[in-house]
């Protein structure tokens, strides 16, 4: 059985301050059954960005409908970027479990914040 | 409070065909996928269509598949299921459902009966 | 026919403890839930994703799972438990939801 993989195509996306970061993700497998989600950083302090099954989100929205049953592109778009968003985002498939388990994670997609053109 | 109210339900020969619509409340209709299921009078349940947020994607089991069509009309929160060339054995309650994140149903409507009999 | 296999009944005395089992379905490619329905009712949901109870449910209801058989639990049983309980399922190899036949939990 092939390894599920987790492609983060982009090693790198530069956005003006004020608009909006698209953060490309697909999996290469649905199975095993288990979530997506978005962190900034990696390690222990990393930050949770997203999540379909549960949390509230404002400026995070999916850029495929999380809902088709053959849905593989979990890729996010964050609007109204600031410098506070800069770091690495990594798109992490988990296993169900309880808690689910970390299965697979992407290289990461390094953003970074240009000041808005005057 | 989620709220899934079905109607059209009746009686009906067999050869024909109904509508039944499912009015949704209480959260935002347009972010969820749905599902219809039924119930044989003294029987078990029956997942017989599925549908996404968007209504681009629709899923059926093989017993009504090419008979029965899922729809959506995201504008008016309302949730369809057309039937056609029904038969005896399709005769049930119908409910509509609310799907969670990962394709389980957490909310039911009361159901609404389609009798099939000459 | 049913794709999942759970007992078509259970019988359990007030305060003892009730458990109904449901397999049938690969662990790897399936997400599991249980409903509760009372005559005359639509059905509840009492445990989803395997072993997650939603809100309102009473703690006395729990999921687990082991290898491709999944288990509902209620501990000290009470007589509006009294109920017919259906596992589902949702395959991700197959994009389906199947059901279990039910199975009638009888409180002594």
């Known amino acids: 059985e092939e390894e599920l993989q987790v492609i983060q195509p982009e090693k790198s996306v530069s956005v003006a301050a004020g608009d909006s970061a698209t953060l490309n993700c697909t999996v290469s497998s649905l199975i095993p059954v288990g979530p997506i989600q978005w962190f900034r950083g990696a390690g222990p302090g990393r930050e949770l960005i997203y999540n379909l099954k549960e949390g509230h989100f404002p400026r995070v929205t999916p850029v495929s409908d999380p809902t088709k049953r053959n849905n593989m592109d979990f890729s996010i778009r964050i609007s109204n970027i600031t410098p506070a968003d800069a770091g690495t985002y990594y798109c992490v498939k988990f296993r169900k479990g309880s808690p689910d388990v970390e299965l697979k994670s992407g290289a990461g997609t390094e953003l970074s914040v240009r000041a808005k053109p005057s | 409070e989620v709220q899934l109210v079905e109607s059209g339900g009746g009686v009906v020969q067999p050869g024909g065909s109904l509508r039944l619509s499912c009015a949704a409340s209480?959260?935002?209709?347009?972010?969820?996928?749905m599902s219809w299921v039924r119930q044989a009078p003294g029987k078990g349940l029956e997942w017989v269509a599925g549908?996404?947020?968007?209504?681009?994607?629709?899923y059926y089991p093989a017993s009504v598949k090419g008979r029965f069509t899922i729809s959506r009309d995201n504008s008016k929160n309302t949730l369809y299921l057309q039937m056609n060339s029904l038969r005896a054995e399709d005769t049930a309650v119908y409910y509509c459902?609310?799907?969670?994140?990962?394709?389980?149903?957490?909310?039911w409507g009361q159901g609404t009966l389609v009798t099939v009999s000459s | 026919s049913y794709e999942l296999t759970q007992p078509p009944s259970v019988s359990v005395s007030p305060g003892q403890t009730a458990r109904i089992t449901c397999s049938g379905g690969?662990?790897?490619?399936?997400?599991y839930a249980w409903y509760q329905q009372k005559p005359g009712q639509a059905p509840v949901l009492v445990i989803y994703?395997?072993?997650k109870r939603p809100s309102g449910i009473p703690e006395r209801f729990s999921g687990s799972s082991s290898g491709t058989t999944v288990t509902l639990t209620i501990s000290g049983v009470q007589a509006e438990d009294e109920a017919d309980y259906y596992c589902?399922?949702?395959?991700?190899?197959?994009?389906?939801?199947?059901f279990g036949g039910g199975t009638k939990l009888t409180v002594l």
């Open positions: 209480g959260f935002t209709f347009s972010s969820n996928a």
């Open positions: 690969a662990y790897s490619s399936y997400y």
């Open positions: 459902a609310r799907e969670t994140w990962n394709h389980l149903f957490d909310y």
């Open positions: 549908i996404s947020a968007g209504g681009s994607d629709t």
């Open positions: 994703s395997d072993d």
């Open positions: 589902g399922g949702y395959d991700q190899s197959s994009y389906t939801n199947p």
